[in-house]
């Protein structure tokens, strides 16, 4: 009778993460009697995956009934595959021995590669806000994908960006990979409602790319424009001066009125008007009792926006 | 001694889902002796929440040690609050009796309202694709929030949309609410890379709105433009005619060449060139052996795109 051979028909198997992997193995003979075991890797450090004789292997099921006397099929199925399961799997026949069973013959091995989806891309923006016409950087990160080939694109409001740099790590072989990309985006005044989108295509996504987004509202500061004007008199000896604070973002704003350099009133902007582009407007007014002044008065509207250095606009009120 | 009073100092308490709710209750006297119980709701259908005497209430802990002889504080804390826990909670004193303890006095009740975050908004687009200049509808749904007040906005590539309709259900009181909004979006040829964004603001989100996105790439069909041209002769008696199929989306495209109305060749577009706006171009050519024709030949390039009715462009090849 010909000596037993261990047949592993597939050189390689590729499985999507989360699915089950079936690893095929057949014997050409029932003898010598003895169990089979499956290992990942070869040599002293090999990892036991399944032992027909004993042990608990909750993720492994056998394709055939291994307890049947005439069984020659020792294929197994491993459930819920993750990238950490990648490697070469060997089906090994043992012959009965004492005190321990003795390795008799190994199959040629089946290489299991795992197709793992990238994690949802996380897009993060700059730590501090910048003003229009400045360039800010956004990063996009995703992890845990396999194989290594991946395509990443950046968009701003649907328009593809070209100024970005992408790295995939590690450079060598690994069970899974990570991607890190940094895009440079020039801000414009209308960017409060803008978004940057990081789009990733990978073999596991079946042509349906993953997208991560970030709002430029987190990255932009639009400084206000100030306009001080005198309104028609409501009553004699009273001047009504308004300070129109326009097109600023974000909300945080404190306004101080000065009369001839002396602080008259400080207020924090609360009820704001939102413009279509996402910036805000606010108006403050000051009633000046002209009786109290003999000479002309210089009224200054001083605005501190989002913790930045104050900007101001003055108006000379003529006392007639 | 004055008769015992049951003090529930707070008329109402508002708690975020997932947090613990502390419901305060104090007695003004130690007598009559007897246990306390907490109920949600009043009357025959009230629900037992905690019984000092017996039972297992895994989510309830007492703030004080109720076993201490001189204890007058019967406040409780309920863990892991959900919207289903909303309601009015009553602290009720019983006096010992036979065979059963007898209800003696109830507190005024504390209304527990639960602030629950909306679920991540799910944006879904039309079931079938539409072509530029047509209007498509996108829906945005979110569930499980409380209180009812919520603000929803739609954006397309950062620009706010105004053509939408929003409903919050149910109209009456409920432990939690759902929102459903439908926006109408006019497609343009450049919308393959566009996104619509549904943005929701709610008291539970601390000014950090939730966003759901959908890609117009799933909703749009950009039909191709065809151009048939004759290229310079490669060899005598051979005419090279190309059909340039431009600016189409999605990919699926089949092209048929006809010579004088008879099918010459059919091919499926594979290696496509992607334009910056996300649409695709493809070129097919046909070599015509002019020896085989005595008279002029009408060459037709017929394209079936994305399962739609075929479009075609013809070219009259003059046999000199």
């Amino acid at each position: 009778e010909d000596e037993l051979q261990v047949i592993q028909p597939e050189k390689s198997v590729s499985v999507a993460a989360g699915e089950s992997a079936t690893l095929c193995c057949a014997m050409t003979s029932l003898i010598p009697v003895g169990p089979i075991m499956w290992f990942r890797g070869a040599g002293a450090g090999r990892e036991l995956i399944y032992n027909q004789k004993e042990g608990h292997f909750p993720r492994v099921t056998t394709v055939s009934e291994l307890t049947k006397r005439n069984n020659l099929d020792f294929s197994i199925s491993i459930s819920n595959i993750t990238p950490a399961d990648a490697g070469t799997y060997y089906c090994v026949k043992f012959r009965k021995g004492s005190p321990d069973d003795v390795e008799f013959k190994s199959g040629a091995g089946t290489e299991l590669s795992v197709r793992a989806k990238p994690s949802a891309p996380v897009v993060s923006g700059p730590a501090v806000r910048a003003t229009p016409e400045h360039t800010v950087s956004f990063t996009c990160e995703s992890h845990g994908f396999s194989p290594r080939d991946i395509t990443l694109k950046w968009f701003k409001n649907g328009n593809e960006l070209s100024d970005f740099q992408t790295n995939v790590d590690p450079a060598g072989d690994s069970v899974s990979y990570s991607i890190h990309s940094t895009a440079r985006v020039v801000l414009t005044r209308g960017d409060v409602h803008s978004q940057v989108i990081c789009e990733m295509a990978h073999i596991t996504l079946q042509g349906d790319p993953l997208r991560g987004t970030a709002n430029l509202s987190e990255a932009i500061r639009v400084p206000p424009t100030l306009e001080v004007t005198q309104q028609p008199m409501r009553a004699e000896n009273q001047a009504n001066v308004t300070c129109q604070v326009s097109n600023f973002y974000p909300r945080g704003l404190q306004l101080t009125w000065l009369e001839n350099g002396n602080v008259s009133r400080t207020e924090t902007a609360s009820t704001l008007i939102e413009n279509k582009d996402g910036t805000y407007n606010w108006m403050s007014w000051l009633l000046v009792n002209t009786c109290a002044h003999r000479d002309d008065v210089v009224l200054t509207c001083q605005v501190e926006h989002d913790g930045q250095q104050a900007v101001s606009k003055s108006y000379a009120l003529e006392i007639s | 001694e004055d008769e015992l009073q049951v003090i529930q100092p707070e008329k109402s308490v508002s708690v975020a889902a997932g947090e613990s709710a502390t419901l305060c209750c104090a007695m003004t006297s130690l007598i009559p002796v007897g246990p306390i119980m907490w109920f949600r709701g009043a009357g025959a259908g009230r629900e037992l929440i905690y019984n000092q005497k017996e039972g297992h209430f895994p989510r309830v802990t007492t703030v004080s040690e109720l076993t201490k002889r001189n204890n007058l504080d019967f406040s409780i804390s309920i863990s892991n609050i959900t919207p289903a826990d909303a309601g009015t909670y009553y602290c009720v004193k019983f006096r010992k009796g036979s065979p059963d303890d007898v209800e003696f006095k109830s507190g005024a009740g504390t209304e527990l309202s639960v602030r629950a975050k909306p679920s991540a908004p799910v944006v879904s687009g039309p079931a079938v694709r539409a072509t530029p200049e047509h209007t498509v509808s996108f829906t945005c749904e979110s569930h499980g929030f409380s209180p009812r007040d919520i603000t929803l906005k739609w954006f397309k590539n950062g620009n706010e949309l105004s053509d939408f309709q929003t409903n919050v259900d149910p109209a009456g009181d409920s432990v939690s609410y759902s929102i459903h909004s439908t926006a109408r979006v006019v497609l343009t040829r450049g919308d393959v890379h566009s996104q619509v964004i549904c943005e929701m603001a709610h008291i539970t989100l601390q000014g950090d709105p939730l966003r759901g996105t959908a890609n117009l790439s799933e909703a749009i069909r950009v039909p191709p433009t065809l151009e048939v041209t004759q290229q310079p002769m490669r060899a005598e008696n051979q005419a090279n005619v190309t059909c340039q199929v431009s600016n189409f989306y999605p990919r699926g495209l089949q092209l048929t060449w006809l010579e004088n109305g008879n099918v010459s060749r059919t091919e499926t577009a594979s290696t496509l060139i992607e334009n910056k706006d996300g649409t695709y171009n493809w070129m097919s050519w046909l070599l015509v052996n002019t020896c085989a024709h005595r008279d002029d030949v009408v060459l037709t390039c017929q394209v079936e795109h994305d399962g739609q009715q075929a479009v075609s462009k013809s070219y009259a090849l003059e046999i000199s």
């Epitope: 027909q52 006397r69 009965k96 021995g97 | -």
Partner: antibody, heavy 120, light 107 residues
Framework: QVQLVQSGAEVKKPGASVKVSCKAS????????ISWVRQAPGQGLEWMGW????????NYAQKLQGRVTMTTDTSTSTAYMELRSLRSDDTAVYYC?????????????WGRGTLVTVSS | DIQMTQSPSSVSASVGDRVTITCRAS??????LAWYQQKPGKAPKLLIY???NLQSGVPSRFSGSGSGTDFTLTISSLQPEDFATYYC?????????FGGGTKVEIK
């Protein structure tokens, strides 16, 4: 035909030795193990030991250690069991059995048994 | 060593009866249990291997079940030729051990 044929009955004096043979036919002898099992009159079954016909490795029951030796001759497809220093309580029917389980031990083929009587 | 305890030691039954014999191992043996039938003056005969697998040529009225420490042999409808002694045997590890036997007698 697949079978195990055992040698004939033996009568021995206490202190003597006995060697029982078991000849296999109809299957590949070296592919399986052989166990020896005995049964005293009116008693149950007692496993004595096992030998691999492939390698000659053995495993003996603790109580017989030092008194029993199991061997095989693959050229004749025969297994042997020798028991030394016989005592009267060694009187029993001795069976050889083919061990056929892959991961476990069970006996799907038995010899007819050899009666060994130990008597002074 | 793994002890095997069989019960009952004997059972009286009639033709057509359903007979159940149990076997308990002193420690877990997975499914590595066999059942044998022995008639007077004959060698044992394998009925069931690996707890529940019917040996080739054995009638289907015999069945086995169990795993770990508790096992059962069932004869669904006793036939005249089934009156014999039945043994369980653990095959998980050396030393191999047998149960004490159950004698099935005619009522």
């Amino acid at each position: 035909q697949v079978q195990l044929v055992q040698s004939g009955a033996e009568v021995k004096k206490p202190g003597a030795s006995v060697k029982v043979s078991c000849k296999a036919s109809g299957y590949t002898f070296h592919g399986y193990g052989i166990s020896w099992v005995r049964q005293a009159p009116g008693q149950g079954l007692e496993w004595m030991g096992w030998i691999s016909a492939y390698s000659g490795e053995t495993n003996y029951a603790q109580k017989l250690q030092g008194r029993v030796t199991m061997t095989t001759d693959t050229s004749t497809s025969t297994a042997y069991m020798e028991l030394r220093s016989l005592r009267s309580d060694d009187t029993a029917v001795y069976y050889c059995a083919r061990e056929a389980g892959s991961s476990w031990y069970d006996f799907d083929l038995w010899g007819r048994g050899t009666l060994v009587t130990v008597s002074s | 060593d793994i002890q095997m305890t069989q019960s009952p030691s004997s059972v009286s039954a009639s033709v057509g009866d359903r007979v159940t014999i149990t076997c308990r191992a002193s420690q877990g043996i997975s499914s590595w249990l066999a059942w044998y039938q022995q008639k007077p003056g004959k060698a044992p005969k394998l009925l069931i291997y690996a707890a529940s697998n019917l040996q080739s040529g054995v009638p289907s009225r015999f069945s086995g079940s169990g795993s770990g420490t508790d096992f059962t042999l069932t004869i669904s409808s006793l036939q005249p030729e089934d009156f014999a002694t039945y043994y369980c045997q653990q095959g998980a590890s050396f030393p191999i051990t047998f149960g004490g036997g159950t004698k099935v007698e005619i009522k």
